[in-house]
């Protein structure tokens, strides 16, 4: 297993609709054809997996159908979007990148993006 540098923004504020997007960029030492991207959430020293996708270079990322993540890739960059976020989901979202094929296997883990989320104000009652 060889180490690889992964860069991501330090802080992102989610939209009022609970959507946050950020780029995860990795310094690929070779010509990987198969890449796995995993998003981990760290909150109060607990780490949980948010979503993961394996893709072939030049193809779209495909997350599971019920995943809250979507993404696109371009070269050594992965543009990740996390949807359905609530205030309670505020936390550090860490991008983990694995170069699966061809060997050697490389692993890189970013410092994390702190995603801040605020629940939208409830709409005032209106009479029709």
């Amino acid at each position: 297993c060889k180490a690889m540098h992964v860069a991501q923004p330090a802080v992102v504020l989610a939209s009022s609709r609970g959507i946050a997007s950020f780029v995860c960029e990795y310094a690929s030492p070779g010509k990987a054809t198969e890449v796995r991207v995993t998003v981990l959430r760290q909150a109060d020293s607990q780490v949980t997996e948010v979503c993961a996708a394996t893709y072939m270079m030049g193809n779209e990322l495909t997350f599971l159908d019920d995943s809250i993540c979507t993404g696109t890739s371009s070269g050594n960059q992965v543009n990740l979007t996390i949807q359905g976020l609530r205030a309670m989901d505020t936390g550090l979202y860490i991008c983990k990148v694995e170069l699966m094929y061809p060997p050697p296997y490389y692993l890189g883990i970013g410092n994390g993006t702190q995603i801040y989320v605020i629940d939208p104000e409830p709409c005032p009652d209106s009479d029709f």
Epitope: A10, V11, V12, L13, S15, T90, L92, V117, I118
Partner: antibody, heavy 117, light 107 residues
């Protein structure tokens, strides 16, 4: 090293608007946010809101909603805070501060805004 | 919004004495509590992040502890240059908030 340099002092009449700038250097501007904090004479720190320089999303404290606008210009690594309909109790030192994973870490030197007729 | 309360409001201390300032949050904020020092006519400066982590360049006499709702800033062996107002700040949830401050002066 990280530096935030703010625009100079302003004197405004009640009802007017003010726009304070904050130029950042020493880090990748779009990787962080910029928050705005004010401090009335002899008082404590009051959080006003912040903007994510990464995507331009903003979060304002309800008290300032509708009266404040925070923007960024990534091409010059500068953040702006505009406050409208100024009142005498808006007289304060306005600070910009970098928002990182651990809340606010680095601060500007402050801009004194005086509202007086 | 999360309300932070600090105690005491004011403390007059002799040099080399130990100073303890407490900050209480209106609801649990984990360890997302940070401490700042502000001297007269200066900007605040970060001392402690995430309840107990010293910020770069901060003297070792400053330390922090706590989690959840109760937090403490300790200044071991106070020096004359430590005369300032100390604020706690939470970044657990938006909007961010500050405590009202604790003024420390030297006897």
């Amino acid at each position: 090293q990280v530096q935030l340099v703010q625009s100079g002092p302003e004197v405004k009449k009640p009802g007017a608007s003010v726009k304070v700038s904050c130029k950042a250097s020493g880090y990748t501007f779009t990787n962080y946010g910029i928050g705005w904090v004010r401090q009335a004479p002899g008082q404590g720190l009051e959080w006003m809101g912040w903007i994510s320089a990464y995507n331009g999303n903003t979060n304002y404290v309800q008290k300032f909603q509708g009266r404040v606008t925070m923007t960024t210009d990534p091409s010059t690594s500068t953040a702006y805070m505009a406050l409208r309909s100024l009142r005498s109790d808006d007289t304060a030192v306005y600070y910009c501060a970098r928002v990182g994973a651990s809340g606010v870490d680095y601060w500007g030197q402050g801009t004194l805004v005086t509202v007086s007729s | 919004e999360i309300v932070l309360t600090q105690s005491p409001d004011f403390q007059s201390v002799t040099p080399k004495e130990k100073v303890t300032i407490t900050c209480r949050a209106s609801q649990s904020i984990g360890s997302s509590l940070h401490w700042y020092q502000q001297k007269p006519d200066q900007s605040p400066k970060l001392l402690i992040k995430y309840a107990s982590q010293s910020f770069s360049g901060v003297p070792s006499r400053f330390s922090g502890s706590g989690s959840g709702t109760d937090f403490t800033l300790t200044i071991n062996s106070l020096e004359a240059e430590d005369a300032a107002t100390y604020y706690c700040h939470q970044s657990s949830s938006l909007p961010f908030t500050f405590g009202p401050g604790t003024k420390v002066d030297i006897k």
